[in-house]
């Protein structure tokens, strides 16, 4: 099944410390399907869209961008015929990255 | 059913500032990012910034930066937008709007705040 | 900034015609569109987000379609009350640009 699209959602991170919103949506056929967010291949976090909707927001606390390191991804699920889950490919990947310190 | 009610019209002489605040009736406002969209007489619409009231920061366009400050008061459920050092071309109506997270969609609009700058 | 090319810039038709009105992103900005309807003296209304999702109580006419840099907003039958200006947004990334606007008018 089609891959979601991905977007860091404002206010962007300026720094480690700052947290990261990131938004992923599955194509309008699929409603209330269950999200994950990887980073450097790694689960961050779960999120399961309402029925009605097609996507979630992952708010990543300060810090959550030190470790594991990489891009982010994310995937969904539905289920399907019997009642099995059916993972989506891999979405785009996101980069988080900092303005450089001027000190 | 949430309300975004704007101040009155304002009219300002260039080099002046202006803040236009931006009150949230019947519903959640925390959870749901303000933006401000103006627009000036016969153009389209502009986009300006916005603020997550829950985060607290504050996002701007780059045509903007250093002469817009959006802020939020959550515990009055008011968001304000001030711009400095206005000229003519400023003149337009101001929207604010709330915008769901995920799609940054704007579903519910103030009904908007007409600028004036005209010496 | 991603720039955002609306065409046409205004169209004529009349009720009962079949509208396709079409956005193109100066780069790829997958579905993250939103369009909205706009007239004359009132703030604007949201139709389409996610380049294909009918917002709530936006009438079944209205669709939304494509992906990447082309898009287009239909009207299946265009009604009287039909008549406005439309506008795309990107939301991929800061600034979120709009398109300079369509404006449909009456034949």
């Known amino acids: 099944i089609p891959a979601p699209s991905i977007r860091l959602v404002p206010p962007y991170p300026s720094s480690q410390e700052d947290p990261i919103h990131i938004a992923c949506m599955a194509p309008g056929n699929f409603p209330g399907a269950n999200f994950t967010l990887y980073r450097g291949g790694q689960v961050v976090q779960l999120l399961q869209a309402p029925t009605d909707q097609r996507g979630v927001t992952f708010n990543l606390s300060g810090g959550s961008s030190k470790a594991p390191g990489g891009p982010f991804h994310c995937q969904y699920g539905v289920l399907g015929e019997l009642n099995q889950s059916q993972l989506s490919d891999l979405s785009e990947p996101v980069n988080v990255s900092f303005p450089v310190p001027t000190w | 059913q949430v309300q975004l009610v704007q101040s009155g019209a304002e009219v300002k002489k260039p080099g002046s500032s202006v803040k236009v605040s931006c009150k949230a009736s019947g519903g959640t406002f925390s959870s749901y990012a303000i933006s401000w969209v103006r627009q000036a007489p016969g153009q389209g619409l502009e986009w300006m910034g916005g603020?997550?009231?829950?985060?607290?920061?504050?996002y701007y366009a780059q045509k903007f930066q250093g002469r817009v400050t959006i802020t939020a008061d959550e515990s009055t459920s008011t968001a304000y937008m001030e711009l400095s050092s206005l000229r003519s071309e400023d003149t337009a109506v101001y929207y604010c709007?709330?915008?769901?997270?995920?799609?940054?969609?704007?579903?519910?609009w103030g009904q908007g705040t007409l600028v004036t700058v005209s010496s | 900034d991603i720039q955002m090319t609306q065409s046409p810039s205004s169209l004529s038709a009349s009720v009962g015609d079949r509208v396709t009105i079409t956005c193109r992103a100066s780069q790829d900005i997958s579905n993250w569109l939103n369009w909205y309807q706009q007239k004359p003296g009132k703030a604007p209304k949201l139709l389409i987000y996610g380049a294909s999702s009918l917002q709530s109580g936006v009438p079944s006419r209205f669709s939304g379609s494509g992906s990447g840099t082309d898009f287009t907003l239909t009207i299946s039958s265009l009604q009287p009350e039909d008549f406005a200006t439309y506008y795309c947004?990107?939301?991929?990334?800061?600034?979120?640009?709009f398109g300079q606007g369509t404006k449909v008018e009456i034949k």
């Open positions: 947004q990107q939301v991929t990334s800061t600034p979120f640009t």
């Open positions: 603020i997550v009231p829950k985060f607290g920061t504050a």
């Open positions: 709007a709330r915008e769901n997270l995920v799609y940054s969609a704007i579903a519910i």
